[in-house]
Interface confidence: medium
């Protein structure tokens, strides 16, 4: 498949720069607002919170021969969970769940939550036309994962409450194509 | 603004109990952890424990599981602790204090403190 | 639990110099140490967290460093008001501890 466009769906993350002597004192304020995920905590520097990335991909599907006649739209879920404010019991984490810990057990990932199937026509090198029944994605969310279960199989445990896991590094998680067969 | 009251001075009998409040304003209480700490000249700085007020849900010090419970009244934005069979070795300043989670610099840290509430434990 | 260790009590500095606080962890923290002021009479005051993020308002002159076992907290350029006690805490496991304190005096 390709991609001809790919817009994102959340407002810009400004991560805080390290407290070094000879920074700018201006930029280098850690700000609190907005990272505390409460309904009244974005007072300061306020950005939208994201459960995690929803990028709108347009793109054509081919299968080879035969091309989409218009563009699909959908969406890739990808990037890291930052927890929505509306999270029920969502507070952040609290010293006592350990989940700051490098060795911590559970991630957090962004998954595909919604689909829906379409059809789409493709138009072949030929003249003729073919017809595909695909599934795109329409909305993302974010699911715990333990990290004992095998990364290919998606054996994710169900949505909670709980609190996410602090991520000490950047996950790439690719997306998945749209999943399409003849009809 | 963010504030955090406690309860004033209490002056309390060696095996009585004491209940220190911590009335919470200036921001969505049940946003953010409250924790509590306590501060005596031999002993510096100790964490007791951390209450959700969203949940009510509870982690202590281990230390202090037998001596404090910590409680959470939601309509009042107030948090509770209440210190059981209390020995002069009680006799400390005690701080509710917030809980900053910032999740994209991964840190912990108590950023809004209350004044303190000072326990005296003597007969 | 993780012990935290300040191994002086007692700093003494003048105006406009530059001071450096070390705190020393009993075990590998990461960078998850904040830091702590605390004048005279008042609550402790939240500085510096994950070892170098400088907390919301607090001047830049405070700056934080160091991770696994070792952490410094440098004041470039004390200021008369910077006279307090200053902590460490580790938040890298649950109980949460903190360093003795160490009292900068202003000479």
């Known amino acids: 498949f390709k991609n001809d466009a790919t817009e994102i769906l959340y407002s810009h993350v400004v991560k805080p720069v390290p407290a070094h002597p000879s920074s700018n004192s201006t930029l280098n304020q850690a700000r609190n607002g907005g990272r505390h995920f409460s309904n009244t905590g974005l007072d300061r520097n306020t950005r939208v919170q994201v459960g995690c990335r929803e990028l709108r991909s347009t793109k054509y599907i081919s299968d080879g021969q035969c091309t989409s006649i218009s563009p699909l739209k959908e969406l890739v879920c990808a990037g890291e969970c930052l927890p929505l404010p509306v999270l029920p019991n969502w507070i952040g984490g609290g010293y006592g769940t350990k989940y700051w810990s490098r060795r911590s057990s559970q991630e957090w990932r962004c998954v595909n939550d919604k689909t829906r199937t379409q059809r789409i026509q493709l138009q072949c090198q030929d003249g003729s036309t073919r017809t595909y029944k695909i599934t795109v994605v329409t909305a993302c969310k974010c699911k715990r994962y333990t990290r004992q279960h095998n990364e290919s199989s998606h054996n994710f445990e169900s949505m909670s409450p709980a609190k996410p896991v602090q991520h000490h590094r950047e996950r790439k998680r690719a997306s998945k194509s749209s999943k399409h067969s003849m009809s | 603004e963010v504030q955090l009251q406690q309860s004033g001075p209490e002056l309390v009998k060696p095996g009585a109990s004491v209940k220190i409040s911590c009335k919470a304003s200036?921001?969505?209480?049940?946003?953010?952890?409250m924790n509590w700490v306590k501060q005596s000249p031999e002993k510096s700085l100790e964490w007791i424990g951390e209450?959700?007020?969203?949940?009510?849900?509870?982690t202590y010090n281990q230390k202090f599981k037998a001596k404090a419970t910590l409680t959470v009244d939601k309509s009042s934005s107030t948090a509770y602790m209440q210190l059981k069979s209390l020995t002069s070795e009680d006799s400390a300043v005690y701080y509710c204090?917030?809980?900053?989670?910032?999740?994209?610099?991964?840190?912990?840290?108590?950023?809004?403190w209350g004044q303190g509430t000072s326990v005296t434990v003597s007969s | 639990d993780i012990v935290m260790t300040q191994s002086h009590k007692f700093m003494s500095t003048s105006v406009g110099d530059r001071v450096s606080i070390t705190c020393k962890a009993s075990?590998?923290?990461?960078?998850?140490v904040a830091w702590y002021q605390q004048k005279p009479g008042q609550s402790p005051k939240l500085l510096i967290y994950?070892?170098?993020y400088r907390y919301t308002g607090v001047p830049a002159r405070f700056t934080g460093s160091g991770s696994g076992t070792d952490f410094t907290f440098t004041i470039s350029s004390v200021q008369a008001e910077d006279l307090a006690v200053y902590y460490c805490?580790?938040?890298?496991?649950?109980?949460?501890?903190f360093g003795g304190g160490t009292k900068l005096e202003i000479k």
């Open positions: 994950s070892a170098s």
């Open positions: 204090a917030r809980l900053h989670y910032d999740y994209d610099g991964v840190g912990y840290a108590m950023d809004y």
């Open positions: 805490q580790q938040h890298y496991s649950t109980p949460p501890t």
């Open positions: 200036g921001y969505s209480f049940t946003g953010y952890y």
């Open positions: 075990q590998d923290v990461s960078t998850a």
């Open positions: 209450i959700n007020p969203t949940t009510g849900g509870t």
